[in-house]
Amino acid sequence: CVFCRLPAHDLSGRLARLCSQMEARQKECGASPDFSAFALDEVSMNKVTEKTHRVLRVMEIKEAVSSLPSYWSWLRKTKLPEYTREALCPPACRGSTTLYNCSTCKGTEVSCWPRKRCFPGS
């Protein structure tokens, strides 16, 4: 997801540069996060890209990538599921919507989630 939008931020290039500098200290840094299980709408894609840009900027300034694995984990476990739910549930989703795969960046028309899945227990 984080590499699909806002190309001016050059996240993939910056991440590669950061990791090459920190390689000796941070072996897992360069491992590209696997977000293939997720798909987001345009707005959420931009949000997650902007957040990652800001996180990387602080890591660049501090020249420290130790918190990167925990950031990827937070995206995978918390933020991406939250954004997916927002994109596929009311009020954002009505009938169907276009989601972009976080790995391929390709857009697909998908049906909104049923109300029960969006609001369990309602």
């Epitope: 902007e50 957040k51 300034i61």
Partner: antibody, heavy 121, light 111 residues
Framework: EVKLQQSGGGLVKPGGSLKLSCAAS????????MSWVRQTPEKRLEWVAT????????YYTDSVKGRFTISRDNAKNTLYLQMSSLRSEDTAMYYC??????????????WGAGTTVTVSS | DIVMTQSPASLAVSLGQRATISCKAS??????????MNWYQQKPGQPPKLLIY???NLESGIPARFSGSGSGTDFTLNIHPVEEEDAATYYC?????????FGGGTKLEIK
């Protein structure tokens, strides 16, 4: 005591060069990004440049890009600003400042006493 | 660039009273629940000194009579009760977007 000791200011002709220095003490210099901020004669503050903790990343305000170079020597605990092609609008008090973060919010938490740069023919 | 506008340009406050300084940004300086707004104090012949970061967090060693509030585009620095030593110029600064920019300053005089 956390301290930033500045030197290197002075009077220079338009088109000339000057190098400012900022010696740090009382904290682990290599752990912090550092910046230069200037204050015009009208007392307006303007961020000039920032360098990352290890010196790998540098950032400049548009008006000084290609003319000023920020650098650091972590072995000497010293920050530098090499200024060239100086213009009258570069006349200001130049401060070195420690660049810090609270969460992701950046700020300048330690400042040097400043050094005056006057560009005039 | 984000333009920071402070008001008033100067004010005079009686000892022990409240001083209120406003800062307005040309666009929001909030992101993801945080306000990227800082306040500094500068006395004549001295460098600026950090008072408050992230809109409302008091820097270590700064007296509790200083407080910051606000979000989005509108922020306020309050000093209460004002003391003699608070006579200075106060600057707001945003760090939400490059380049980081400062307000024009507010000069506080103690009556």
């Amino acid at each position: 005591e956390v301290k930033l000791q500045q030197s290197g200011g002075g009077l220079v002709k338009p088109g000339g060069s000057l190098k400012l220095s900022c010696a740090a003490s009382g904290f682990t210099f290599s752990s912090y990004a550092m910046s230069w901020v200037r204050q015009t004669p009208e007392k307006r503050l303007e961020w000039v440049a920032t360098i990352s903790s290890g010196g790998s990343y540098t950032y400049y305000t548009d008006s000084v890009k290609g003319r000023f170079t920020i650098s650091r020597d972590n072995a000497k605990n010293t920050l530098y600003l090499q200024m060239s092609s100086l213009r009258s609008e570069d006349t200001a008090m130049y401060y070195c400042a420690r660049h810090n973060y609270g969460n992701y919010v950046g700020y300048f938490d330690v400042w040097g006493a400043g050094t005056t740069v006057t560009v005039s023919s | 660039d984000i333009v920071m506008t402070q008001s008033p340009a100067s004010l005079a406050v009686s000892l022990g009273q409240r001083a209120t300084i406003s800062c307005k940004a040309s666009q929001s300086v909030d992101y993801d629940g945080d306000s990227y707004m800082n306040w500094y104090q500068q006395k004549p012949g001295q460098p600026p000194k950090l008072l408050i970061y992230a809109a409302s967090n008091l820097e270590s060693g700064i007296p509790a009579r200083f407080s910051g509030s606000g979000s989005g585009t509108d922020f306020t620095l309050n000093i209460h009760p004002v003391e003699e030593e608070d006579a200075a110029t106060y600057y707001c600064q945003q760090s939400n977007e490059d380049p980081w920019t400062f307000g024009g300053g507010t000069k506080l005089e103690i009556k």
